[in-house]
Interface confidence: low
């Protein structure tokens, strides 16, 4: 008979996994002993390997929940083409039975005693509830049993008494204005506020409690300005030393507004707190050196190599600059006098080029002469080689940027009969005369 064939057998669950398909014979499915099969969908899964006993199942629940019972477990002979130990055919179940006891004794119900007396009403005025209780001890339950029903019951009760209303304060009223406009007078300024026992008022019959606490409260006024005190100048201090070691400087005298210090918003002292005088050291000031602009880069070379031009071989080149203008022990120029960089030499290298777009129009030349013209150009621009933009020259010193250096020989297809530069000229129109602006104003 045809079977469903699977690619895996899961030992832990005994399930077939990875359906390959149906309609094949057991013999064909089991050409691979790692496969498994089912005779029908959802049926028993049998692995294709040689038969052996499955693991024992877990024990089934105990047959009774209290006192002694028994429970079963099983294992199955699973596999194909052979027998399990004991000459048992695949599919056969083997059972084990053992005694079990979830709980030694079985629960027994108890019985209630009679109801006790009603407790007093839960309130002393208006309506409330009262309660009575009974005990589960007639007889007491055994082995975790219980009594059926409730251990207490409640009913409504009416005291036939009207409840009193107790007094409660309404919110505080606003603070009254302060008794004075500033601090420091003979009487400390105070403010007052009041409240009423009206939220609600206490009842007369039956008598309610009055509101607790005071109907008035007082506090010291805060935030009042003290009386202002005007400030007064102290004496001039000593003249400060000349603050410079060369050239002209400025010395200073100071005085403080502290005779007295202005207080409580009083006005500050009128006039200046400092006065200055010129002082002369008669010593010329040092002049720091300043770097000239960098010189031209030296040719791009590599030590021990005659030429590296037109090759993907990085070299080095340097440029220098001069520190000028240092006088009277001024600072030397900061930084390096020599700049070194890595380079590829494309000096005189024949490179493929491409014509640039037109440049912007240049200035009119000559500016003050006859018939000035302006020009624009298209240049044969070299296409630079795609050499690596960084190199590692010395082990452990990391990557260094490499720059192209030199004037290559770009080669473009001829344009308007030219190989390197095509120029277009135009006359400048409506040209004004050149006049000295100083003379114009006279």
């Amino acid at each position: 008979d045809p079977v469903l064939c699977f690619t895996q057998y899961e030992e832990s669950s005994g399930k077939c996994k990875g359906l390959l398909g149906g309609g094949v014979s057991v013999e064909d499915c089991c050409l691979n002993t790692a496969f498994a099969y089912q005779k029908r969908s959802g049926g028993l899964c049998q692995p294709c390997r040689s038969p052996r006993w499955s693991l024992w199942s877990t024990w089934a629940p105990c047959s009774v929940t209290c006192s002694e019972g028994s429970q079963l477990r099983y294992r199955r002979c699973v596999g194909w083409n052979g027998q399990c130990s004991g000459k048992v055919a695949p599919g056969t179940l083997e059972w084990q039975l053992q005694a079990c006891e979830d709980q030694q004794c079985c629960p027994e119900m108890g019985g209630w005693s009679g109801w006790g007396p009603w407790e007093p009403c839960s309130v002393t005025c208006s309506k409330g509830t009262r309660t009575r209780r009974r005990a589960c001890n007639h007889p007491a339950p055994k082995c975790g049993g219980h009594c059926p029903g409730q251990a207490q019951e409640s009913e409504a009760c009416d005291t036939q008494q009207v409840c009193p209303t107790h007094g409660a304060w309404a919110t505080w009223g606003p603070w009254t204005p302060c008794s004075a406009s500033c601090h420091g007078g003979p009487h400390e300024p105070k403010e007052t506020r009041s409240r009423k026992c009206s939220a609600p008022e206490p009842s007369q019959k039956p008598p309610g409690k009055p509101c607790p606490g005071l109907a008035y409260e007082q506090r010291r006024c805060t935030g009042l300005p003290p009386c202002p005190v005007a400030g007064g100048w102290g004496p001039w201090g000593p003249v400060s030393p000349c603050p410079v070691t060369c050239g002209l400087g400025q010395t200073m005298e100071q005085r403080t507004c502290n005779h007295p210090v202005p207080q409580h918003g009083g006005p500050f002292c009128a006039g200046d707190a400092t006065r200055t005088h010129i002082c002369n050291t008669a010593v010329p000031c040092p002049v720091d050196g300043e770097w000239d602009s960098w010189g031209e880069w030296s040719p791009c070379i590599r030590r021990n190599m005659k030429s590296i031009s037109c090759q993907e071989i990085p070299g080095q080149q340097s440029r220098g600059r001069t520190c000028r203008g240092r006088k009277f022990d001024g600072h030397r120029c900061a930084g390096q006098q020599q700049d070194i960089r890595h380079c590829y030499s494309i000096q005189h290298c024949p490179l493929k080029g491409s014509w640039s777009e037109w440049s912007t129009w240049g200035l009119c030349m000559p500016p003050c002469g006859p018939n000035p013209t302006r020009a624009r150009q298209r240049l044969c621009t070299p296409l630079l080689p795609k050499y690596p933009p960084t190199v590692s020259m010395v082990e452990g010193q990391g990557e260094k940027n490499v720059t192209f250096w030199g004037r290559p020989l770009p080669r473009c297809e001829e344009l308007q009969g030219q190989k390197l530069v095509v120029e277009e000229k135009r006359p400048c129109l409506h040209v004004p005369a050149c006049k000295d602006p100083e003379e114009e104003e006279l």
Epitope: C310, Q311, E312, I313, L351, K352, L383, P385, K386, Y387, P388, V391
Partner: nanobody
Framework: EVQLVESGGGSVQAGGSLRLSCAAS????????MAWFRQAPGKEREGVAA????????YYTDSVKGRFTISQDNAQKRVYLQMNSLKPEDTAVYYC????????????????????WGQGTQVTVSS
């Protein structure tokens, strides 16, 4: 006519190593650049590694840096590609290429820069 012949391909488990060899019919000193390219099924040819002037400069695509090494033996007229820590995504046909040109337009790992090509050798990496 210049000929390049690759060898050393084959099947290997992930994590394993292979060494590809490319034999040239002329002295490889005459080539400025020699390189290895690869092409996986349904993908474009990709530059893997290149060597300039017998190893003065070497270039690698990012995905193989630290795993592949290009080297050459001038006496044997051979260029090699040592491939370590192979991955399933390294599966492809590997080609050897060479050129005498020196000024690049697109870069040393671009196939249109190379004049001479081998027939290729298959490398299969299984997981």
């Amino acid at each position: 006519e210049v000929q390049l012949v690759e060898s050393g391909g084959g099947s290997v488990q992930a994590g394993g190593s292979l060494r590809l060899s490319c034999a040239a019919s002329i002295s490889i000193r005459s080539f400025n650049y020699m390189a290895w390219f690869r092409q996986a099924p349904g993908k474009e040819r990709e530059g893997v590694a290149a060597s300039y002037a017998g190893g003065v400069s070497t270039y690698y695509t990012d995905s193989v840096k630290g795993r592949f090494t290009i080297s050459q033996d001038n006496a044997q007229k051979r260029v090699y590609l040592q491939m370590n820590s192979l991955k399933p995504e390294d599966t492809a046909v590997y080609y050897c290429a060479a050129t005498q040109d020196v000024i690049w337009r697109t870069g040393p790992l671009e196939s249109d820069e190379y004049r001479y090509w081998g027939q290729g050798t298959q490398v299969t990496v299984s997981s």
